[in-house]
Interface confidence: low
């Protein structure tokens, strides 16, 4: 029988005696064959950390602060549950730690040097450690003690809780640097007077504090956001600028064998029978003998956190370096104005092979990190283990949701001008062999598919999309008898299709070789029914000008294109006989790389790009024999985006609908964690 | 139990300083909470002049801040008031208390108050 | 910020309810945690001030429940629901919501 108790780490004596009557509790609700509480207590935090790294505890509630150790090495544990504050209908489980101005002071981030800064308290998250940690490698040497730096860096301060006898400046704008709301100046709403009192140039609070201090619309408009990439924005606009975004009180347990879900039941229950209103005997945000007892006495209730969520991601890149700098100190050698090396990310062994080549070429501007999968090259992109990839436009929808920003945008049109203007983009068609005349749109039902992969546009989200329109659920692999759609669970009759071996099956990355656009035709060719690709696929690998056995006799007079219309046409005509539009593959990076990789990749098309008139010697960028490596090979060039700078701005809202509605859909298990931080 | 105890002077004359001492039992002042002056004058008005906090910063009424200082000895646990110029109108019974924090920022423990005359 | 208290004295017999105000000149309530930041004081003749009730409606530890405190944002109330000889004291509120702090003038409860 499996064992279904959680062990639930206690700090302190009324924590213990409020954890007891939590056990008891549940037990009087909840059959004897459901999850059921023990108690253990410990001296911290920190002990309670490594009690459940060592498998004497299972779980306990962290500040973020709390979470970032106990995701380090050795006790790596992850979040699994979090706390939720406001209703449940708009359920909130972070906070935006922002930099507040004034509308005319004309400054940006990293401008702050000599400016006077008004903190809520020393040490506290949003009002301290994030800004100072942020800034920390601007800090001018030696560094340590910090308050020091801090006092040295901007020309006055009031942070509150500071020691105003050895770091008076610290004090400067309100004496004596008093640590309760007796100093006017301490907490959220203190730093905002500060500001607002023109004592300070920048306060460092939540997004919150300015609505709860200023009620009046015109009020804010007198203020402004400083956002990382030295911008501003309108105070509104915090999920777009912020410092950090933080968790506010989270459930964690071990990464391996961490009870995850019998947690999620645990806690799930415990707030049906004992939650906010719920029981007069026993309430599990409140806390009679105490404050914040095992959860916060402001919670409303728990939100399971998506499993594909580790530490880092769940608190954020912003926030781990803010606070990965403030724990280790570590700046590079003197700070200067050049870019450091790009880190791309290869999907798995084919694409690995032509970034090494390139890393070569390009003489230690580009470096390369490899991953299995496109959403684990994002994840990485994320956390900063890589920079930038190359994407189809499904997976910009994915990555914009996870915080980064289209930078270039793949040509694949001969012009003048390639660089200076980013096509309207390419055609998504459903491709059919023509001898399977009886085949249209409207009868597709138990026929054999064949798809890029699941995520991406031409070979998901469009058609997908537009089935959903039609049939009203998502059980896609029970409408096309058998497919190959690489991304779909192992088991479905849409990785039936598909031809990798073993473990590589259906695996979306190159090792299946019916993955791509290239793999979908492939795929129809030798096995199905429809593939779904772009409107180039066909032409590009027929004619002979594919080399590869399976292509090199084909002919592109013996396919054609569903029309929407449930007529068929040759594949020439897909400007009139196209499912939808798509946008170009786009390059994404990080807001903070965001310069630095437009500037190296511009760089690096000259030296790489079509201009290079023979690849058999040299290197070129945009080759792979077809095989779509790192970039699509019938990019012409990299080209700006001028204003369509945002991931919604660069897919256009027809797309963005569209894959909006598909979400119900959706198995991408990095969409859920990202929408989980970004609803 | 938290017991905070008043010393000083019962006359002093106008144009000098004032020192008094709170000598704090059965807590350190070095371990947590702020440690405030209040004082109240004959009429019973009560007014809050300044505290010390725990990490030794210190905020002060701004009525008061150009002639008024707390400082501490947290080898003896005690902390002090000093209040220069003194005129009649700081005739007053002083106390030293202590903000709870919890409850946060009111005084939960206070001394018993040392009446102090400014006459010459 | 100013606090004004009424009456300023009043006399009653054991066993009577009794009310006491204060009123501040500006909102004493943080809209962030949603708390009243005022709490209310009892000073018997030759004493220090004793708190009783902290955000304008918690007591504090020992306190008997006879004492009340209500109110929220300018106007605030302590209630005696009944009166015993040993309340005889005079009774402060005090605003910790802004800097710096500041106590109203009292009102001396006097028995009959």
């Known amino acids: 029988v499996p064992d279904k108790t959680v062990r639930w780490c206690a700090v302190s004596e009324h924590e213990a005696t409020k954890c007891q009557s939590f056990r008891d509790h549940m037990k009087s609700v909840i059959p004897s064959d459901g999850p059921s509480v023990a108690c253990v207590k410990k001296a911290s935090y920190l002990d309670c950390i490594r009690a459940i790294a060592a498998n004497e505890a299972d779980a306990v509630t962290l500040d973020a602060g709390l979470v970032y150790d106990a995701y380090l090495a050795p006790n790596n544990l992850k979040p699994v549950v979090a706390e939720f504050y406001g209703s449940k209908e708009d359920p909130q489980t972070f906070y935006y730690a922002v930099a507040v101005v004034k509308k005319d002071s004309g400054f940006q981030m990293n401008q702050l040097r000599g400016k006077k800064s008004c903190h809520t308290g020393l040490g506290r998250s949003a009002g301290w450690n994030i800004p100072i940690g942020l800034l920390y490698c601007d800090l001018p040497e030696p560094r340590k003690p910090l308050e020091k730096a801090v006092a040295n860096f901007f020309s006055g301060s009031c942070a509150p809780c500071a020691d105003g006898t050895d770091f008076p400046q610290l004090c400067q704008l309100c004496p004596g640097c008093g640590c309760s709301t007796l100093n006017q100046y301490f907490g959220y709403s203190g730093a905002f007077k500060c500001l607002k009192d023109g004592a300070g140039d920048v306060a460092f609070v939540k997004h919150s504090t300015i609505f709860e201090n200023l009620a009046n619309k015109a009020d804010r408009d007198q203020y402004e956001l400083l956002c990382l990439d030295n911008t501003r924005k309108p105070v509104d606009e915090y999920k777009d600028c912020h410092l950090a975004q933080v968790p506010s009180h989270t459930v964690v347990a071990r990464s391996m064998g961490g009870k995850e879900d019998l947690i999620w039941e645990l806690l799930n229950q415990a707030q049906e029978h004992f939650g906010k209103d719920k029981s007069k005997e026993f309430q599990l945000f409140s806390s009679p003998h105490g404050k914040d007892l095992l959860f916060k006495d402001s919670a409303h209730g728990f939100l399971k956190v998506p499993p594909r969520m580790d530490a880092k991601m769940y608190l954020g890149y912003e926030y781990v370096t803010a606070i990965r700098n403030l724990r280790e100190g570590t700046c590079p050698e003197a700070p200067t104005d050049e870019c450091k090396p790009v880190k791309w990310c290869a999907l798995s062994h084919h694409e690995r092979l032509k970034c090494d080549e390139w890393s070569v070429n390009s003489v230690g501007k580009i470096e390369c990190v490899s991953a299995e999968t496109t959403e684990d090259c994002i994840a990485k992109i994320m956390n900063g283990e890589a920079d930038a990839m190359s994407l189809d436009g499904g997976f910009v929808y994915i990555a914009g949701k996870c915080g980064l920003v289209p930078v270039l945008a793949e040509n694949y049109n001969k012009s003048d001008n390639c660089e200076d203007t980013p096509e309207a983009g390419y055609f998504a068609i459903a491709v059919v062999k023509k001898s399977a005349s009886d085949l249209t749109w409207d009868n597709l039902k138990g026929k054999k598919s064949c798809h890029t992969a699941v995520g991406r546009t031409a070979g998901w989200n469009i058609p997908m999309g537009l089935l959903y329109n039609k049939i009203n659920h998502c059980r896609f692999d029970e409408f096309f008898s058998e497919g190959c759609a690489p991304g779909s669970k192992k088991d479905s009759s849409l990785c039936k299709l598909c031809m990798g071996s073993g473990l590589n099956l259906c695996e979306p990355n190159n090792k299946e070789g019916y993955y791509g656009y290239t793999g979908a035709f492939r795929c129809l060719v030798e096995k199905g029914d429809v593939a779904f690709v772009k409107h180039q696929t066909v032409p590009q690998n027929t004619g002979g000008k594919n080399p590869d056995p399976w292509a090199k006799n084909l002919n592109e007079k013996d396919y054609e294109l569903l029309c929407l219309d449930g007529t068929r046409k040759p594949v020439e005509e897909y400007a009139n006989c196209h499912l939808a539009r798509a946008p170009n593959h786009a390059v994404v990076t990080r807001k903070d790389k965001e310069a630095c990789v437009h500037k190296i990749l511009r760089q690096q098309q000259h030296l790489f790009g079509s201009n290079v008139t023979d690849c058999s010697g040299n290197f070129c960028l945009f080759r792979s024999e077809t095989k779509d490596l790192l970039f699509r090979d019938d990019t012409v060039c990299l080209a700006k985006l001028h204003d369509r700078n945002t991931y919604e701005k660069y897919l256009g809202e027809e797309y963005v609908k569209a894959v909006g509605n598909l979400r119900k859909c959706s198995t991408s298990s990095l969409l859920e964690a990202c929408t989980f931080r970004r609803p | 139990e938290v017991q905070l105890q008043e010393s000083g002077p019962d006359l002093v004359k106008p144009s000098q300083s004032l020192s008094l001492t709170c000598t704090v039992t059965?807590?350190?002042?070095?371990?947590?909470?702020?440690w405030h002056w209040i004082r109240q004058f004959p009429e019973n008005k009560l007014e809050w002049l300044g505290y010390?906090?725990?990490?030794?910063?210190?905020n002060y009424s701004p009525s008061l801040k150009s002639r008024f200082s707390i400082t501490r000895d947290t080898s003896k646990n005690q902390f002090f008031l000093q209040l220069n110029s003194v005129t009649t109108e700081d005739t007053a019974t002083y106390y030293c208390?202590?903000?709870?924090?919890?409850?946060?920022?009111?005084?939960?423990?206070w001394g018993q108050g040392t009446t102090v005359t400014v006459s010459s | 910020i100013e606090l004004t208290q009424s009456p300023s004295s009043l006399a009653v017999s054991v066993g009577e309810k009794v009310t006491m105000t204060c009123k501040s000149s500006?909102?004493?309530?943080?809209?962030?945690?949603?708390?009243?930041?005022l709490a209310w004081y009892q000073q018997k003749p030759g004493q220090s001030p004793k708190l009783l009730i902290y955000?304008?409606?918690t007591r504090e530890s020992g306190v008997p429940d006879r004492f009340t405190g209500s109110g929220s944002g300018t106007d605030f109330t302590l209630t005696i629901s009944s009166v015993k000889a040993e309340d005889l004291s005079v009774y402060y509120c005090?605003?910790?919501?802004?800097?710096?702090?500041?106590f109203g003038s009292g009102t001396k409860l006097e028995i009959k």
């Open positions: 059965g807590y350190s002042i070095t371990s947590g909470y702020s």
């Open positions: 955000w304008a409606s």
């Open positions: 010390i906090h725990s990490s030794g910063a210190t």
């Open positions: 005090q605003q910790y919501y802004s800097y710096p702090p500041t």
């Open positions: 208390a202590r903000d709870g924090y919890s409850p946060p920022y009111a005084m939960d423990y």
């Open positions: 500006q909102s004493l309530l943080y809209s962030t945690n949603q708390k009243n930041y």
